[in-house]
């Protein structure tokens, strides 16, 4: 497993159930880089942190997946968690 994947999983596992639900909803509308598709809503809403990490990495690869995860965390007001995720990714 890659460092970025571990960092994404760590961040998502640190969210409360309510925050994880909000994360998924924001992920459905977060601005994406050109050329990237959106994870289908139906698949997304039932996922736990582990499944969601796998889906983020498979859709966006590790580097962009970590950046996107950090941005959604920022959109949720979780800037410190976002900074920790990016620091872990760039170690």
């Amino acid at each position: 497993m890659g460092r970025a994947r571990d960092a994404i999983l760590d961040a998502l596992e640190n969210l409360t159930a309510e925050e994880l639900k909000k994360f998924k909803l924001k992920l459905l509308s977060v601005p994406l880089r050109e050329g990237y598709g959106r994870i289908p809503r139906g698949a997304l809403l039932s996922m736990d942190a582990l499944d969601l990490t796998d889906k983020l990495v498979s859709f966006y690869l590790e580097t962009y997946g970590a950046e996107l995860t950090a941005n959604v965390l920022r959109d949720m007001g979780l800037q410190e968690m976002a900074a920790a995720l990016q620091a872990a990714t760039h170690q």
Partner: antibody, heavy 114, light 107 residues
Framework: QVQLQQPGTELVKPGASVKLSCRAS?????????????LEWIGNINLSNGRTNYN??FRAMATLTVDKSSSTAYTQLSSLTSEDSAVYYC?????????????WGQGTSVTVSS | NIVMTQYPKSMSLSIGERVTLRCKAS??????VSWYQQKPEQSPKLLIY???NRYTGVPDRFTGSGSATDFILTITSVQAEDLADYHC?????????FGAGTKLELK
């Protein structure tokens, strides 16, 4: 349009404390503005779970709390000096992305004077 | 802490002029920059968020651009009601920080 309700003015003595209130929702920020100066972020609180973040500059003097039952955010400012005379705004972040402050209260003017 | 530097500090202009306000972040803040308008004795109002997204109800003469460290607010044809202070702010990292503001005044 969401209206954030804040009381208008507070007059307090040096060394005393004041508790400011704001009827709000979601993430509520507190921002200080001295006369003729820029904006300074004090901190924020999430009304749904009580999660807080502070600007270290204000951590010793500001305490952010929430009363969920009335959807009211509070900031208690303690050991006040003349430097703390300012308008204190509350603001919400309701836009889904980029976490801007999209709704602002009208501000509470705090005057510290003996 | 991320420092937001705004310039110029003030601008004197005529109605109908094109205005460019600048904001520079001390480190990369992606697109996490907002612009606020504040008129005397009023609370700030959100104009632009995410560097370039116009907030609901904001006239299209206001345009935001930039990313990373350099950001611009452009007013294509300034109106009398636009004379105010303009603040940029970043929401990329805590503590959230603002620039010192730019004051738009009439010539």
């Amino acid at each position: 349009q969401v209206q954030l309700q804040q009381p208008g003015t507070e007059l307090v003595k040096p060394g005393a404390s004041v508790k400011l209130s704001c009827r709000a929702s979601g993430w509520t920020h507190w921002v200080k503005q001295r006369p003729g100066q820029g904006l300074e972020w004090i901190g924020n609180i999430n009304l749904s779970n009580g999660r807080t973040n502070y600007n270290e500059k204000f951590r010793a003097m500001a305490t952010l709390t929430v009363d969920k039952s009335s959807s009211t955010a509070y900031t208690q400012l303690s050991s006040l000096t003349s430097e703390d005379s300012a308008v204190y705004y509350c603001a919400n972040s309701m836009v889904p992305h980029f976490f801007p402050m999209d709704y602002w209260g009208q501000g509470t003017s705090v005057t510290v004077s003996s | 802490n991320i420092v937001m530097t705004q310039y110029p500090k003030s601008m004197s202009l005529s109605i109908g002029e094109r205005v460019t306000l600048r904001c520079k972040a001390s480190e990369n803040v992606g697109s996490y920059v907002s612009w606020y308008q504040q008129k005397p004795e009023q609370s700030p109002k959100l104009l632009i968020y995410g560097a370039s997204n116009r907030y609901t109800g904001v006239p299209d003469r206001f345009t935001g651009s930039g990313s990373a460290t350099d950001f611009i607010l452009t007013i294509t044809s300034v109106q009398a009601e636009d004379l105010a202070d303009y603040h940029c702010g970043q929401s990329y990292n805590y503590p959230l920080t603002f620039g010192a503001g730019t004051k738009l005044e009439l010539k």
